[in-house]
Amino acid sequence: LRPSRVHDSEGGTTRALTLEDILNGTFTYKTFFPNWISGQEYLHQSTDNDIVYYNIETGESYTILSNATMKSVNASNYGLSPDRQFAYLESDYSKLWRYSYTATYHIYNLNNGEFIRRNELPRPIQYLCWSPVGSKLAYVYQNNIYLKQRPEDPPFQITYNGRENKIFNGIPDWVYEEEMLATKHALWWSPNGKFLAYAEFNDTEIPVIAYSYYGDEQYPRTINIPYPKAGAKNPVVRIFIIDTTYPQQTGPREVPVPAMIASSDYYFSWLTWVTDERVCLQWLKRIQNVSVLSICDFREGWQTWDCPKAQEHIEESRTGWAGGFFVSTPVFSYDAISYYKIFSDKDGYKHIHYIKDTVENAIQITSGKWEAINIFRVTQDSLFYSSNEFEDYPGRRNIYRISIGSSPPSKKCITCHLRKERCQYYTASFSDYAKYYALICYGPGLPISTLHDGHTDQEIKILEENKELENALKNIQLPKEEIKKLEVDDITLWYKMMLPPRFDRSKKYPLLIQVYGGPCSQSVKSVFSINWISYLASKEGIVIALVDGRGTAYQGDKLLYAVYRKLGVYEVEDQITAVRKFIEMGFIDEKRIAIWGWSYGGYVSSLALASGTGLFKCGIAVAPVSSWEYYASIYTERFMGLPTKNDNLEHYKNSTVMARAEYFRNVDYLLIHGTADDNVHFQNSAQIAKALVNAQVDFQAMWYSDQNHGIPGLSSKHLYTRMTHFLKQCFSLSD
């Protein structure tokens, strides 16, 4: 429980959160992620916007890039070369999709304090990075990859076939960026910079989504994106590796695809360098329940990459799809052949396994009715990972160390008891060889970032403790938050409830369900946040609940894979079940219950409103999916299979929002979407609106011109104001 403060320490009066507090970001917290440059050195941007160097062991610190230098080219980001001779300064940031953006890059010589003018980089660049050693540069410009041996050298062009919306080299196309790689890049340097691996995506045959971008001109522009919807033609991917020492000699060499993968449609899912001459590629069948990890070796004599069948490791799911949201990536040992990987154990929980020869002989090194979530680092004697084991709360993240050296394997929770009440949700950032690490705590109390010794785990210093925020919140009445569980028919439904500051169990309160509910998501987390729903609980006296139902993550495969091939059924049922349980608690006004969600949450909230239960008075869907035939192939087919008659077309048709249009008659529905949504296309809401109109069902709607899936900026303020008015009207709360 997070206590509500009704009086500050001096006994003065306090105030509730306001909508303006939320819209203006008055109560935002800070985190501190060191930009590690060695085992004991890191860079960080100071409050004055200088880039400052820190040495943990000597205590030395100095500015390596002044704010003035950054400002001289309007830079908003930087990257230091590993040899510390140069830095790139990034300016003219122009967002594209979720991760991708273009920018202008200036190379600054740290030795003489001057910008390099010889062979300047073209603009705008789609991606740029230093080699892991020295100061070679690889970059992508107009869908082609270029290499510079030194920043002042002329570039060597690696690929020539790049074409906008057709062939992508070194960067992903839309679907790979959003649904597979989750990065803006698709090129990878080998550990010492000898080789450069890259992906080529051929989108020639992919159908194009086209939508208007209204802008300020007389005629709107049309945005065209090759975007494979469920069942459509997919990108064709190839992986190449080039020797960067003598790139002109042999040129790029293609890495072969495992035969069992190449026999039908497939995806490339990730690339991990093991050594300069060994690389690990992961592939996935289009029907995403079979993944193959392939370890490939460089053959000097032939200048080719060889991927022996004996080094192919198959991961297959018989109960759902392979992996969690993504197939996990391997973390290799120092022997450069064995590795650690998270996958389902025989009880259906995701755990860390050690694979030495075959997956069948894998040694399971974590086990229990909880899940290992991330492997942060493996050293000679330790493995650091996060899990939700501690005290059986799935929404926690603690950091553990397994000792793997010359003594018996032992497991220690590094974070569980550090700041037990304040911190139960951590991530970590490790320096080279895990000599030091930063722990970043996200809650449930105020976030705090600390620096630790990698051998003793001793705290060295606090990096950021959000003191100003703590002081600012002293006179704010925050909602009480509790995380509990409901046991219903052999299913555990974890929920987070936010209660108004002066909550009285004998009174009746309106209830708002905030839902996401997508496969492998988690909403009930022990994290600190002050957002729109905090305001609704604090100022408007609304009880807020978030529920993790079937399909959500980190509680085992039974819960996760329950929704396999049946999206839109159990997620909705479980929200409804939870609402009924909340009503039984006695403090909910059952005539004032609402549900809202964004994206997948908009889909679930729409289906819940149209469930015919009579539980919900009103609800809001922001940027909802309305039919799985409209959404991206990689995501949709992972969970639903193909929209074909001999696969799962029937459920594709049964699970649309439009099919339930009639059921919206007895609820108040607010439908919201950005017209320039590249992700969940405006088409989804257009089809809901059309079905409601055709059924002569009244509803409210709002579109946001030229806004994407996030509806940011001024539109965001308008959106939350609009939703607030709608909810207050629904709950009969005075404005």
């Epitope: 064995s338 154990d345 030495k356 397994i402 018996p408 394997p409 032992s410 220690k412």
Partner: antibody
Framework: QVQLQQPGAELVKPGASVKLSCKAS????????LHWVKQRPGQGLEWIGE????????NFSEKFEIKATLTVDSSSNTAFMQLSRLTSEDSAVYYC??????????????WGAGTTVTVSS | QIVLTQSPALMSASPGEKVTMTCTAS?????MYWYQQKPRSSPKPWIF???NLASGVPARFSGRGSGTSFSLTISSMEAEDAATYYC??????????FGSGTKLEIK
């Protein structure tokens, strides 16, 4: 194949000492640590101690620190445990066992057949 | 030192029956190991690192648990499974401690 050979039985008088042997075959004794385990008739397993044959380092359970002495003769690929000042409480089967300490194993993979020590006057 | 308590001390099961025995540690341990011992024989490694089967152990056996509570399960009892099973742990080593054993008989 890998084996640990132990003599079947030893009959000793109270107050005397006995030196039990454990001969390794199929591998070099210095490659793995050797542990000794006691089992009284109808009872459970009790760890006595271990020796690292490569350097002679050893660890004991507190209870056996005075009672047991562990040595290795690498030339004969044999480990020894000497038990001193024997009493009827020391009557038991004594096993030598090899520790597989390869990554993430850490279990006793090879066991001798055990030597039954009977302390009786 | 950490004390391991096994329960039950003695149990019997019919062929095909599911069998579960437990091992409780007096304080939290990282991993549990199990050994099988038949009369007049040396112990054999059975389960290591809580949940991994040693070489040659039938797949009907499984191990699980964490903290202070661990178990060994046989999904479908067979005659050859009749034996005494010992749990063992390394936390706080030295010393190593074993449980007192669970004797499993066939009905």
């Amino acid at each position: 194949q890998v084996q640990l050979q132990q003599p079947g039985a030893e009959l000793v008088k109270p107050g005397a000492s006995v030196k039990l042997s454990c001969k390794a075959s199929g591998y070099t004794i210095t490659s793995y640590s050797l542990h000794w385990v006691k089992q009284r008739p109808g009872q459970g397993l009790e760890w006595i101690g271990e020796i690292n044959p490569a350097n002679g380092d050893h660890n004991f359970s507190e209870k056996f620190e005075i009672k047991a002495t562990l040595t290795v003769d690498s030339s004969s690929n044999t480990a020894f445990m000497q038990l001193s000042r024997l009493t009827s409480e020391d009557s038991a089967v004594y096993y030598c066992t090899r520790l597989d300490d390869s990554r993430f194993h850490w279990y006793f993979d090879v066991w001798g057949a055990g030597t039954t020590v009977t302390v009786s006057s | 030192q950490i004390v391991l308590t096994q329960s039950p001390a003695l149990m019997s099961a019919s062929p095909g029956e599911k069998v579960t025995m437990t091992c409780t540690a007096s304080s939290s341990v990282s991993y549990m190991y199990w050994y099988q011992q038949k009369p007049r024989s040396s112990p054999k490694p059975w389960i290591f690192l809580t949940s991994n089967l040693a070489s040659g152990v039938p797949a009907r056996f499984s191990g699980r648990g964490s903290g202070t509570s661990f178990s060994l399960t046989i999904s479908s009892m067979e005659a050859e499974d009749a034996a005494t099973y010992y749990c063992q742990q390394w936390s706080g080593y030295p010393p190593i401690t074993f449980g007192s054993g669970t004797k499993l008989e066939i009905k």
